[in-house]
């Protein structure tokens, strides 16, 4: 029961996390900037991974996509890549984990297969969360390194004067969404990995068995040990048959009533 709960909770937490990573990636508020207060209107710039926007206090907003892939900073491309990889891994992880859920029966899928799938999805969620956290952190670092002094620098350019306005960009809402979402995906992944341990068979220790016929037509059930599936009464991997099947270490004894089927 605890395993099912852990697995289910891990799935839900990861689902919320991946939804958050997708939301953060699509958001425009990765960096925000309060430009200036004007007697007429206040103007705000905010930028995301895909486009740049200007908003006035009147509510008017205008957004435009970045020009080309080539003209963009390598760091922005890296952040985009990390976020997309995070989303793709997370989506695949969700798909795998749906089939791995203990509460869902698909054909005659064994618990060992479900355990492997749970572990796979857990690892995928962990990597997905790390990708998102890394992407957001790289962008945050870009903002910190661009947190210039607010002094204006004048120089002459083509067609007149160019004034570089070194305004301070601040962390946008998308960064916080990304960090939280990445963390949730990571936690969900860890929970899936923990659940995997509970799903996995406790002992799959099959000993080499030699069979010694001690009667005329005696049938033996093969396999002196049975791996636990987590269901039924044989949860401690006890020996099922005492006689007939003997390991090579054991002394041969006379057949008992348990040897016959």
């Amino acid at each position: 029961m605890a395993v099912t709960a852990c697995q289910g909770l891990g799935f839900v937490v990861s689902l919320i996390g991946i939804a958050g990573i997708i939301a953060a990636t699509c958001m425009d508020q990765w960096s925000t900037q309060d430009l200036y207060n004007n007697p007429v209107t206040a103007v705000f710039n905010y930028q995301g991974l895909w486009r740049s926007c200007v908003r006035e206090s009147s509510g008017f907003t205008e957004c435009r996509g970045y020009f080309t892939l080539l003209g963009l900073p390598a760091m922005l491309q890296a952040v985009r890549a990390l976020m997309i990889v995070g989303i793709v891994l997370g989506a695949i992880g969700l798909l795998v984990s749906i089939f791995a859920l203990k509460c869902i029966r698909i054909g005659s899928m064994e618990d060992s297969a479900k355990a492997n799938m749970t572990l796979t999805s857990g690892i995928m969620f962990i990597v997905s969360g790390l990708c998102a956290i890394a992407g957001v952190s790289v962008f945050a670092n870009m903002l910190v390194t661009n947190f210039w002094m607010s002094t204006a620098n004048m120089y002459t350019g083509m067609g007149g004067m160019v004034q570089t306005v070194q305004t301070r960009y601040t962390f946008g809402a998308a960064l916080f969404v990304g960090w939280v979402a990445g963390g949730l995906t990571l936690i969900g992944g860890v929970m899936m990995c923990i659940a995997c341990r509970g799903l996995a068979p406790e002992e799959t220790n099959y000993k080499a068995v030699s069979y010694h016929a001690s009667g005329h037509s005696v049938a033996y059930k093969p396999g002196g040990f049975k791996a636990s599936t987590g269901f039924g009464s044989n949860t401690k991997n006890k020996k099922i048959y005492d006689g007939g099947a003997r390991t090579e270490d054991e002394v041969q004894s006379y057949p008992s009533k348990h040897d016959y089927v």
């Epitope: 960096s31 900037q33 430009l35 004007n38 007429v40 209107t41 103007v43 710039n45 930028q47 740049s52 926007c53 200007v54 006035e56 009147s58 008017f60 205008e62 435009r64 970045y66 020009f67 003209g71 963009l72 900073p73 922005l76 870009m142 903002l143 661009n146 204006a152 350019g157 067609g159 007149g160 004067m161 160019v162 004034q163 570089t164 306005v165 305004t167 960009y169």
Partner: nanobody, 120 residues
Framework: QVQLVESGGGLVQAGGSLRLSCAAS????????MGWYRQTPGKQRELVAS???????NYADSAKGRFTISRDNAKKMIYLQMNSLKPEDTAVYYC??????????????WGQGTQVTVSS
């Protein structure tokens, strides 16, 4: 790089009219605002009028009621219609644009200026 090119300046009689134009070109993501400033010898540049993306305008007291600023967002152009010109309006008129050119890149660009002379 963003270029601002002004045109429309010249010599005009007091009480006359002039229309200044400014065209912006180059890598412009967002035009926060564009405006006209003027400078007379020995004085600092002063704001005449500015216009935001939404069309919201801002005028200096000396320009109110006589000057009208307008904008064509598609062409990235601004215009300054100057009516009832006075000799004290004589100055070099500069076009100004506050522009976002890329990620974390915001610059204020100035044109080379156009001379407006109002004779009495």
């Amino acid at each position: 790089q963003v270029q601002l090119v002004e045109s429309g300046g010249g010599l005009v009689q007091a009480g006359g009219s002039l229309r200044l134009s400014c065209a912006a070109s180059g890598r412009i993501l967002n035009l926060n605002d564009m405006g006209w400033y003027r400078q007379t010898p020995g004085k600092q540049r002063e704001l005449v009028a500015s216009i935001f993306s939404s069309g919201t305008t801002n005028y200096a007291d000396s320009a109110k009621g006589r000057f009208t600023i307008s904008r064509d967002n598609a062409k990235k152009m601004i215009y300054l219609q100057m009516n009832s010109l006075k000799p004290e309006d004589t100055a070099v008129y500069y076009c100004n644009a506050d522009v976002v050119t890329g990620l974390l890149q915001r610059n204020v660009y100035w044109g080379q200026g156009t001379q407006v002379t109002v004779s009495s």
